[in-house]
Interface confidence: low
């Protein structure tokens, strides 16, 4: 049998390992695809993203929702010839989420 | 130009964003590498691994130290010809992490 | 607040080298973005962009004055150090150094530096 | 390098009238990333440089409202709508927008 302060516990593990948004390290460069001689500094910025477990296999914690966060980085050209710009840069930052089916059945087909 | 109260908020986000143990969400039977038959409920756990960045494109972030800690979790088998079984799960959770080179030169040789 | 404070010799003969340093407070050239400049004005002349270095230690020169010059950074004390080899009296100027932003915010009050013999 | 010339080289000006100072450079100062980086200074007797204006036309904190800065690609002013005594040394231009940053020669600004 199974006492209740056990199944307490693991239903709060559960809870929090469920599919939500949770304060992730993005690398900005690759985030905005930008060009090779151009870098920031700092190279990561913390947003929330979708992450998360999902009940079955078949589905994928996936985002429904999105705002853009302004984050201020120095953006810096290779050579070093300019200042290092201090310039906004927005960042995807998930709102909500959902198990969402990984392949989707073509809804139009 | 900028003003010290702004680097003071780029620097703090950049300490948030470097590489240390986070807590993250842990499929417990792809870790344990168990048959897909032998699955876990809940199927995720947290606890905490290396994760975030490091300055240098050449660097990751890795685990120097790790501890076990025990899940107690439903063992299920397919097909269902037994109760689930709430077992205890050993999980590695990362207690010290550093950015190291991806590819270390041999130290031995 | 920041501050900038530049020291070195009044006075150096020509075809010496001359030694300035840079000793600075309010921030640290270890703080991303950040780079320490030198920049020099003959009396009653233009001012001249000379060096700089940034936090991660790269350096730039004024192309003209590249061969006779030489910047370094010691980050634990808060200076930075610019060589000029093979004064001349043309090179007679005030000397300011700066902290390198965009523009130039801070400035050191300047040290000035005859040649001659 | 980018060549900075200014004119005026000298402004003999009185109290309560309006001033302007002409800044003209070698080449475009649009940088790659859009903004142009030309910059204002004023160096008061035995002083050392002071930002006025910042990217063409942005006062810089503390700086009077009288101070005002115009222009794009090559052509560039700056004005001073009303001069008053503390307004006179000598005002720079300066680019950094290319290496090696340059500055103009200066335009001596003092009370008739």
């Known amino acids: 049998f199974y006492d209740i302060e056990t199944l307490k516990v693991i239903d709060e593990e559960w809870q929090r390992t469920q599919c939500s948004p949770r304060e992730t390290c993005v690398e900005v460069a690759s985030e905005l695809g930008k060009s090779t001689n151009t870098f920031f500094k700092p190279p990561c910025v913390n947003v929330f993203r979708c992450g998360g477990c999902c009940n079955e296999e078949s589905l994928i914690c996936m985002n429904t929702s999105t705002s853009y966060i302004s984050k201020q980085l120095f953006e810096i050209s290779v050579p070093l010839t300019s200042v290092p710009e201090l310039v906004p840069v927005k960042v995807a930052n998930h709102t909500g989420c959902k198990c969402l089916p990984t392949a989707p059945r073509h809804p139009y087909s | 130009f900028y003003d010290i109260e702004t680097l003071k908020v780029i620097d703090e986000e950049w300490q948030r964003t470097q590489c240390s143990p986070r807590e993250t969400c842990v499929e417990v039977a792809s870790e344990l590498g168990k048959s897909t038959n032998t699955f876990f409920k809940p199927p995720c756990v947290n606890v905490f691994r290396c994760g975030g960045c490091c300055n240098e494109e050449s660097l990751i972030c890795m685990n120097t130290s790790t501890s076990y800690i025990s899940k107690q979790l439903f063992e299920i088998s397919v097909p269902l010809t037994s109760v689930p079984e709430l077992v205890p799960v050993k999980v590695a959770n990362h207690t010290g992490c550093k950015c190291l080179p991806t590819a270390p030169r041999h130290p031995y040789s | 607040q920041v501050t900038l404070k530049e020291s070195g010799p009044a006075l150096v003969k020509p075809t010496q080298t001359l030694t300035l340093t840079c000793t600075f407070s309010?921030?640290?050239?270890?703080?991303?973005?950040?780079?320490v400049g030198w920049i020099r004005q003959p009396p009653g002349k233009a001012l001249e962009w000379l060096a700089n270095i940034w936090w991660n230690d790269d350096k730039y020169y004024n192309p003209v004055l590249r061969s006779r010059l030489t910047i370094s950074k010691d980050t634990s004390k808060n200076q930075v150090v610019l060589t000029m080899t093979n004064m001349d009296p043309v090179d007679t100027a005030t000397y300011y150094c700066?902290?390198?932003?965009?523009?130039?915010?801070?400035w050191g009050e300047g040290t000035l530096v005859t040649v001659s013999s | 390098d980018i060549v900075m010339t200014q004119t005026p080289l000298s402004l003999p000006v009185t109290p309560g009238e309006p001033a302007s100072i002409s800044c003209r450079s070698s080449?475009?100062?649009?940088?790659?990333?859009?903004?142009?980086?030309l910059h204002w200074y004023l160096q008061k007797p035995g002083q050392s440089p002071q930002l006025l204006i910042y990217?063409?036309?942005n006062r810089f904190s503390g700086v009077p409202d009288r101070f005002s800065g115009s222009g794009s690609g090559t052509d560039f002013t700056l004005k001073i709508s009303r001069v008053e005594a503390e307004d006179v040394g000598v005002y720079f231009c300066?680019?950094?927008?290319?290496?090696?940053?340059?500055f103009g020669g200066g335009t001596k600004v003092e009370i008739k």
């Open positions: 300066s680019q950094s927008t290319h290496v090696p940053w340059t």
């Open positions: 080449q475009s100062l649009v940088h790659i990333n859009g903004n142009t980086y």
């Open positions: 309010g921030f640290s050239l270890s703080d991303y973005g950040m780079g």
């Open positions: 990217k063409v036309s």
């Open positions: 700066v902290q390198v932003t965009n523009p130039f915010v801070f």
